[in-house]
């Protein structure tokens, strides 16, 4: 059930990424490390890289508040699972700086893609049942 709650958190992060994609023109255009084709057992490490990236508002007025709120929520850590803790200490996972840097639009698309992949893996590996807590 704890793992389910964690995946529901991933599900929520996808919505926040979608919200930010609506404001991509109001984001600072700086290129950011954007993991792609993440190797097995390094997914949590890659998510940590996405969360650490310096995504920020371009400070262009109207949408600044919602953008900053969304970025803050994206970066908020949820309680770690055992798998997550193990991965963060794996020396074999690439460092954040080693990933190709991409502009905000592609950065957000790759983040969403990884989150969806993790939900897919979780739901595909589960036995029959519900997401109730």
């Amino acid at each position: 059930q704890g793992q389910d709650r964690h995946m529901i958190r991933m599900r929520q992060l996808i919505d926040i990424v979608d919200q930010l994609k609506n404001y991509v023109n109001d984001l600072d255009p700086e290129f950011l490390p954007a993991p792609e084709d993440v190797e097995t057992n390094c997914e949590w490490s890659a998510i940590s890289c996405f969360q650490k990236a310096q995504l920020k508002s371009a400070n262009t007025g109207n949408n600044e508040r919602i953008i900053n709120l969304s970025i803050k929520k994206l970066k908020r850590k949820s309680p770690s699972t055992g798998a997550e803790r193990r991965q963060k200490h794996r020396l074999t996972c690439p460092s954040c700086d080693s990933y190709e840097k991409k502009p905000p639009k592609e950065f957000l698309e790759r983040f969403k893609s990884l989150l969806q992949k993790m939900i897919h893996q979780h739901l595909s590996s589960r036995t029959h049942g519900s997401e109730d807590s």
Epitope: D15, I16, L69, E131, S133
Partner: antibody, heavy 116, light 107 residues
Framework: QVQLVQSGAEVKKPGASVKVSCKAS????????MHWVRQAPGQGLEWMGT????????IYSQNFKGRVTMTRDTSTSTVYMELSSLRSEDTAVYYC?????????WGQGTLVTVSS | DIQLTQSPSSLSASVGDRVTITCRAS??????LNWYQQKPGKAVKLLIY???RLHSGVPSRFSGSGSGTDYTLTISSLQPEDFATYYC?????????FGGGTKVEIK
């Protein structure tokens, strides 16, 4: 068990506002986002937006932006949806729905009638 | 926005029939497709999430399948309590969108 209980039917005049409540029980209120969906008479379902009860972060459908406000009261595990500048086309049943991997539990619905 | 087209919009069937409802998305939604049942005056119920996962308490006669843009809800043997309207909904991209619904009526 999970339960979402909504406030009763409302009749409003055009231009007025309506505030619908949705009281949650049977789970940890702040763990799940709450979505609002409406259904006009004889029509399908239309998504209005969502709120994270842990911090009141909201995402609204462009169709309702500027007219809808979603809030929450953690002390009573209640979410609210307020719709302003009502027009006749807003006559509908309004539903709250908890979102896990899907809208897994729904309120019974609140009929809002907009009529002069 | 992602459009969902449900077909048929209505169908007549008898108890015991096998019923299939389809939902086509305007773009790939990567299995983030859910199915709901609505009866007049009752709360909407989730039947299936993520294409094929049965929600708790839902009878096994309901099943879902599909991928990419095309998805299906099947009721293997229609029961009297299954006469209702069914909606698909995509959870891939905001805004959340629903299909137009399929009303299953008694023949």
């Amino acid at each position: 068990q999970v339960q979402l209980v909504q406030s009763g039917a409302e009749v409003k005049k055009p231009g007025a506002s309506v505030k619908v409540s949705c009281k949650a029980s049977g789970y940890t209120f702040t763990d799940y986002w709450m979505h609002w969906v409406r259904q006009a008479p004889g029509q399908g379902l239309e998504w209005m937006g969502t709120i994270d009860p842990s911090d009141q972060y909201t995402i609204y459908s462009q169709n309702f932006k500027g007219r809808v406000t979603m809030t929450r009261d953690t002390s009573t595990s209640t979410v609210y949806m307020e719709l302003s500048s009502l027009r006749s086309e807003d006559t509908a049943v309004y539903y709250c729905a908890r979102y896990g991997f899907a809208m897994d539990y729904w309120g019974q619905g609140t009929l809002v009638t907009v009529s002069s | 926005d992602i459009q969902l087209t449900q077909s048929p919009s209505s169908l007549s069937a008898s108890v015991g029939d096998r019923v299939t409802i389809t939902c086509r998305a305007s773009q790939d939604i990567s299995n983030f497709l859910n199915w709901y049942q609505q009866k007049p005056g009752k709360a909407v119920k989730l039947l299936i999430y993520y294409t094929s996962r049965l929600h708790s308490g839902v009878p096994s006669r309901f099943s879902g399948s599909g991928s990419g843009t095309d998805y299906t809800l099947t009721i293997s043997s229609l029961q009297p309590e299954d006469f209702a309207t069914y909606y698909c909904q995509q959870g891939h991209t905001l805004p959340r969108t629903f299909g137009g619904g399929t009303k299953v009526e008694i023949k």
